[in-house]
């Protein structure tokens, strides 16, 4: 682990890999191509990262600056309630969800949106620089 990191942050970290953006104490990857939710998750895991888990409203607002109308997959799913991939519940923001069949979470510049998981979307990975294991 890079110095000062814990499960949700990595402070005083070195720079991020190519094509990743350093923001705060984390590295973010904004995809150019589109995949379904599961394939997006696999892409992130293969790079020692995880589909974006947002820790608070501040992080969400900061990231939305880099987003457009296009939705991006994030590490949020509805399994008897909306939960992040780290197991924590979604409690700082509302997700626009209309249908029981929409069980994966996405984000755009306007907020969080539920979608059917096989829809091909852009995605966002998040990690600590240089394979730090504090993934979220």
């Amino acid at each position: 682990l890079c110095q000062g990191s814990n499960y949700s942050t990595c402070a005083s970290c070195p720079s991020c890999p190519d094509r990743w953006m350093k923001y705060g104490n984390h590295c973010y990857y904004f995809s150019v191509e589109e995949k379904d939710w599961n394939s997006s998750l696999e892409f992130c895991l293969a790079r020692d990262s995880h589909l974006l888990v947002i820790t608070d409203n501040q992080e969400m607002s900061l990231l939305q600056v880099f987003l457009s109308e296009a939705f991006c997959w994030i590490g949020l799913r509805n399994n008897s309630g909306w939960r992040w991939e780290d197991g924590s519940p979604l409690n700082f923001s509302r997700i626009s969800s209309n249908s029981f069949v929409q069980t994966c979470g996405a984000i755009n510049k306007n907020g969080l949106q539920a979608s059917s998981c096989e829809v091909p979307l852009h995605w966002v990975c998040k990690k600590c620089p240089f394979a730090d294991q504090a993934l979220f």
Epitope: S99, A106, Q113, S116, V119
Partner: antibody, heavy 125, light 112 residues
Framework: QVTLRESGPALVKPTQTLTLTCTVS??????????VGWIRQPPGKALEWLAH???????WYELALKSRLTISKDTSKNQVVLTITNMDPVDTATYYC?????????????????WGQGTTVTVSS | DVVMTQTPLSLSVTPGQPASISCKSS???????????LEWYLQKPGQSPQLLIY???NRFSGVPDRFSGSGSGTDFTLKISRVEAEDVGVYYC?????????FGQGTKLEIK
């Protein structure tokens, strides 16, 4: 609570144009992944898909009827309108609108998770 | 077009007994994304259709667990483990994997 309600004339004459309106509530017609479709059911027969329109105004029609169908939406009024030209007695049916959920294809695969109560249209002179 | 053929076209079941409806497609309805878009709808007398099962085996919200869907490729089945009086109506299978989307001709379930 999601609801859809169809409205339109109960009787039309052959060669006339039928205009059906679906008024929705409980969701927005502009929300990503949402659409509204029209399905009809002739008396004693099976269901037949006619057309659907997506949140971004992308429209799809049943090929055999495409030249006669027009689907449109007015997001501010929460309404989807289907028009069918040159009506014929074989078009006599109950017409349903249903909400359709996007799975990644504009033309097909989706779930119709909520339906209106239907409106019966008879074509007769 | 993909033809969806349901059997039987009607069945009469004693309350508490199981029921099974078959739906066969004229070609495979496994989509290129590996999902199978096969759904089951129930149209109760005088009502509009309602979604029961989506993507072969997933129960829609509020659908009792006595309803289950199974199958793959071209052969699909809807099972009701214990039929209740409220289950009467016409059951339709629906495929959304290929354009145009198509429905089966319907199976009428009655109570003995």
């Amino acid at each position: 609570q999601v609801t859809l309600r169809e409205s339109g004339p109960a009787l039309v004459k052959p060669t006339q144009t039928l205009t059906l309106t679906c008024t929705v509530s409980g969701f927005s017609l502009s929300t990503f992944g949402m659409g509204v479709g029209w399905i009809r059911q002739p008396p004693g027969k099976a269901l037949e898909w006619l057309a659907h329109i997506w949140w971004d105004d992308d429209k799809w029609y049943e090929l055999a009827l495409k030249s006669r169908l027009t689907i449109s939406k007015d997001t501010s009024k929460n309404q989807v309108v289907l028009t069918i030209t040159n009506m014929d007695p074989v078009d006599t049916a109950t017409y349903y609108c249903a909400r359709v959920i996007y799975y990644g294809s504009r033309s097909a695969y989706y779930s119709m998770d909520y339906w209106g109560q239907g409106t019966t249209v008879t074509v007769s002179s | 077009d993909v033809v969806m053929t349901q059997t039987p076209l009607s069945l009469s079941v004693t309350p508490g007994q199981p029921a099974s409806i078959s739906c066969k497609s004229s070609q495979s309805i496994v989509h290129s994304n590996a999902h199978t878009y096969l759904e089951w709808y129930l149209q109760k007398p005088g009502q509009s259709p309602q979604l029961l099962i989506y993507k072969v085996s997933n129960r829609f919200s509020g659908v009792p667990d006595r309803f289950s869907g199974s199958g793959s490729g071209t052969d699909f089945t809807l099972k009701i483990s214990r039929v209740e009086a409220e289950d009467v109506g016409v059951y339709y299978c629906f495929q959304g994997s290929h354009v145009p989307v198509t429905f089966g001709q319907g199976t009428k379930l009655e109570i003995k």
